[in-house]
């Protein structure tokens, strides 16, 4: 069929923040490289119908469906979506190909469906069909990677059962401690599933997909390192694989390693050994202990012993269900206005938690740091000395945890005053919560020393700022004080602050604010 034009269908993914409905356009935005949708002739269809590969789009993503037509002469076109006709403006590119585009900004459920493009050229008419659906991210998962021994080889395979298929990488480091941070030059990354070099100091495997990145560290006991002051502890859930690596370096090959669970040697098939010579001709041996699917009775002390090094143990605890252990009692803090202070939560959890710090309905990123004793700690220092309620929330696959903190900032009261026809009110948010006095200013008392005790009502109330208390004092108007100046004073251990109010007619009439330290 010589008359058929050569057409190409492409998908362009955009990085944009505009908000609009689907529209036909000849002006694509900043974009990533086009993806060929391989338009193929649809067999057994009446007329000439090309069908593009199905397009899956994330919610809120922006895309362009584009058709490139290599046919002589002018073309005209029409887009049809859900029985509605959409305007179509073809243009020609530098290679003189006809270009027709449909831009979909901020993909929503209503924009999913079949997009039909009718093209009329001087030679022939044809239809192109695009099917656009929203990617079901509810089905997305990102699971922590785990290890398996490669069949008949001394190598580890890293597996992460995630959707979409994750990119798996090994993160290797041969230094100690801080220098093994992700950005460090000591860190080497290998984007592959199988790892043969298993002698390194620190070995992690990471999996990443659209949902983020999850890593698992190969639990290691190094017999040449001074043992931790607390026993290393490893938690696993029933059914998960257990991998512990024991590593030892000696001046020559004349030493051996063994693994024991409690007092009993691990059974054949639950360990394998590898050895190599290092650059300085010392011998490195590693002995892996592994259980492909742990049960409750795999709990216990796993001890790696050597004929030339002191033995070291790790406590492996198998749990039915994940957990988060921490004290959830609320904590109150009071600090000075310029005092350095951080909230902190110490917890033990398995699997690793995801967490947030929240203040005044705003969430802040949460960082966690592992401690030597098997606990982790999360600190929050970014409170900017704002008093109120702070919330730490943590969760993993099996558990949730919330802890409340109240931050009070010690400061001298600041007084705001307002008056109405029947009463005068003063407000203060100093901390500790202030006490109030009311004084009448008159000829007899020009310094406002005559105290008013009748008709005064004090209360504390919650203000809009989350969890922050404000104290108020209200003076009910009486004939005895109408027309006079009155002074309300708020005082606490850090000082006193006053406002003077004229009690004659409605409306706020605060005059002078006196700050008396």
């Amino acid at each position: 069929n010589q008359d058929l034009p050569v057409i190409k269908c492409v998908l362009i993914n955009h990085k944009n923040n505009d908000s609009s409905v689907g529209k036909s356009s000849s002006y694509p935005m900043v974009s990533e490289s086009p993806e060929d949708l391989g338009c193929a002739l649809r067999p057994q269809s009446s007329g000439t119908v090309y069908e593009a590969a199905a397009v899956e789009v994330d919610v809120s993503a922006s895309i362009t469906l584009q058709v490139l037509v290599d046919a002589p002469g002018n073309i005209s076109c029409l887009w049809v979506f859900k029985h509605s006709s959409l305007n179509c403006q073809p243009h020609f590119d530098l290679q003189n190909r006809g270009v027709v585009s449909m831009v979909i900004l901020k993909m929503t459920e209503t924009q999913a469906g079949e997009y039909l493009l009718f093209i009329q050229s001087e030679a022939t008419n044809y239809t192109i069909l695009f099917t656009v659906s929203i990617r079901n991210t509810l089905l997305y998962t990102l699971r922590r990677p785990y290890f398996r021994k490669m069949e008949n080889q001394d190598a580890l395979v890293c597996i992460s059962e995630s959707v979409p298929e994750p990119i798996v990488e090994w993160v290797l480091c041969d230094s100690q401690g801080e220098s093994c941070k992700e950005e460090s030059p000591a860190v080497v990354k290998k984007e592959e599933k199988v790892l043969h070099e298993l002698f390194g100091t620190d070995i992690r495997c990471c999996a990443r997909n659209e949902l983020g990145r999850e890593c698992t560290r190969l639990f290691t006991i190094d017999l040449n390192q001074t043992p931790q002051t607390t026993l290393p502890q490893l938690f696993l859930k029933v059914g998960e694989p257990l991998w512990i690596r024991c590593k030892a370096v000696h001046v020559n090959h004349g030493f051996g390693l063994t693994w024991e669970l409690e007092n009993k040697a691990l059974e054949e098939g639950n360990y394998f050994e590898m050895s190599t010579y290092s650059t300085n001709r010392t011998m490195i041996r590693i002995l892996f202990a592994f259980v492909s699917s742990v049960a409750r009775n795999d709990t216990g002390y796993y001890t790696c012993s050597s004929s030339k090094h002191p033995s070291q143990s790790a406590l492996v605890t198998i749990v039915e269900k994940g957990f988060i252990n921490a004290t959830n009692s609320s904590e109150d803090y009071e600090i000075d206005q310029y005092e350095e202070f951080c909230f902190s939560v110490r917890f033990k959890a398995y699997p690793q938690i995801r967490c947030t710090w929240t203040f005044s309905r705003k969430s802040f990123p949460c960082e966690q740091k592992g401690l030597d004793n098997g606990y982790s700690i999360s600190k929050f220092c970014n409170h900017k000395h704002q008093p109120g309620e702070y919330i730490f929330h943590a969760e993993n696959d099996d558990a949730q945890f919330t802890k409340m903190f109240t931050l009070n900032i010690r400061r001298k009261p600041q007084v705001l005053a307002e008056a109405s026809a029947s009463q005068a009110s003063c407000f203060s948010d100093g901390y500790p919560l202030p006490s109030w006095t009311w004084k009448k200013c008159s000829d007899k008392s020009p310094n406002c020393t005559e105290e008013i005790t009748e008709g005064v009502w004090n209360r504390k109330a919650n203000r809009k700022v989350f969890g922050q208390w404000v104290s108020s004092s209200t003076l009910n108007m009486s004939e005895a004080i109408k027309g006079f100046l009155v002074k309300c004073c708020a005082y606490n251990s850090l000082g006193t602050s006053c406002e003077t109010i004229l009690l004659n007619s409605p409306g706020p009439f605060p005059f002078i604010q006196d700050n008396i330290s």
Partner: antibody
Framework: EVQLVESGGGLVQPGGSLRLSCAAS????????MSWVRQAPGKGLEWVAS???????YYPDSVKGRFTISRDNSKNTLYLQMNSLRAEDTAVYYC??????????WGQGTLVTVSS | DIQMTQSPSSLSASVGDRVTITCKAS??????VAWYQQKPGKAPKLLIY???YRYTGVPSRFSGSGSGADFTFTISSLQPEDIATYYC?????????FGGGTKVEIK
Amino acid sequence: EVQLVESGGGLVQPGGSLRLSCAASGFTFSSYAMSWVRQAPGKGLEWVASINSGGFTYYPDSVKGRFTISRDNSKNTLYLQMNSLRAEDTAVYYCARGGTTVFDYWGQGTLVTVSS
Amino acid sequence: DIQMTQSPSSLSASVGDRVTITCKASQDVSTAVAWYQQKPGKAPKLLIYSASYRYTGVPSRFSGSGSGADFTFTISSLQPEDIATYYCQQHFNTPRTFGGGTKVEIK
């Protein structure tokens, strides 16, 4: 049923030697760490030596260089060779299964008396 | 070496009483602590391992708790057959060390 039976105890002069044996039954002897623990008359327990399934040996400083622990897996037997014995080595010597962590089974003990 | 300090060294209690023995390690030993019972003229018997786990066949009146450096052994309701000396032991590191023992008698 796990059974540990010690033998070889007796009276020995200071500076002398003695070899204790422990016959084990009722479990896979070769798979387990084994130990010797002693108890001086009227006193508490003191760990003396351990050997794990791989044959690696461990001693406290008080006996290092004088005592040697060994095992014969084909005979299901644990040994303690004691040389240069001193009066303070006088004790009941117990053979115990374990030592990598806890001691889960104990024999009835054999008395070693070091005296001139 | 890690020292295990047991207290009291002896105690006297009535049948049915709750008995508590403490053991203090000279450094953090995590939960790597065991408790043994030794009756007069007999070999010791393992009662509790990993600080709080009862060994097979041990009656439920015996329990253990603690982590770090402070450990407690409890007999919830003392029975006549519980007359014995009780020892704690750490297996956090070599050498394995025992407490000095607590002799439990019946009033």
